[in-house]
């Protein structure tokens, strides 16, 4: 079954390569187990950047290798992606799955365009 997912259209990463955005889903029921996946769509590729499963009210548990962290509050997930560089600029899509209890629901956001600007190197001091 389909579900609406909202996320910001554009986010600018910090000078330290950190980008945060909120992924909000319209839960049709009272889900107790939720899975959130961040997809990057760019360079003619689709990459699962990170994924987390969480029980409502608990911390997000990301798969190992994750460059993401996050917290949840109700039907909102606050996601942070770290270690970004200019070449990581792209469309980051939030995918939400309500795993339990049945029925299963799937929602995919329209994506957040994350812009990353590499900081200028500090000039040499005399």
């Amino acid at each position: 079954k389909a579900m609406h997912v909202a996320q910001p259209a554009v986010v600018l990463a910090s000078s330290r390569g950190i980008a945060s955005f909120v992924c909000e889903y319209a839960s049709p029921g009272k889900a107790t187990e939720v899975r959130v996946t961040v997809l990057r769509q760019a360079d003619s590729q689709v990459t699962e950047v990170c994924a987390a499963t969480y029980m409502m009210g608990n911390e997000l548990t990301f798969l190992d290798d994750s460059i993401c962290t996050g917290t949840s509050s109700g039907n909102q997930v606050n996601l942070t992606i770290q270690g970004l560089r200019a070449m990581d600029t792209g469309l980051y899509i939030c995918k939400v799955e309500l795993m339990y209890p049945p029925p299963y629901y799937l929602g995919i956001g329209n994506g957040t365009q994350i812009y990353v600007i590499d900081p200028e190197p500090c000039p040499d001091s005399d």
Epitope: D43, T47, E48, V49, L63, D64, D65, S66, I67, M87
Partner: nanobody
């Protein structure tokens, strides 16, 4: 480095399926991000798919999304590429590759320092 040997290539008709296998040895397999690449005659080598060290995260080229599935079996040090709905444009030599790096946003650009010898896939119309 890890040693990689591909198998499973062959000739198949349009719409058919193949499953490629990549056997690894020499180093701890679970420390490597695994990728599949392909190279058609006269073309550059191109990224097909990649999978994280745990197997939980994957990446695909748009051209194979929904048709190909990458997977891995860390216990048996194997990586796989299930290829369905094959078409003549999929004809190429397919290479398995290993990168000793964690996951990120652009696995197609990881430094893959170990490569197999390749296995030929030919899709006839």
């Amino acid at each position: 480095e890890v040693q990689l040997v591909e198998s499973g290539g062959g000739v198949v008709q349009t719409g058919g399926s193949l499953r490629l296998s990549c056997a690894a040895s020499g180093r701890t397999f679970s420390m490597y991000t695994m990728g599949w690449f392909r190279q058609a005659p006269g073309e550059d080598r191109e990224f097909v798919a990649a999978i994280s060290r745990s197997g939980g995260l994957k990446a695909y080229a748009d051209s194979v999304l929904g048709r190909f599935t990458i997977s891995r079996d860390n216990a048996n040090e194997m990586a796989y590429l299930q290829m369905n709905s094959l078409n003549p444009e999929d004809t190429a030599v397919y290479y398995c590759a290993a990168a000793p790096v964690p996951w990120g946003t652009r696995p197609s650009h990881f430094t893959y320092d170990s490569w197999g010898q390749g296995t030929q896939v030919t899709v006839s119309s």
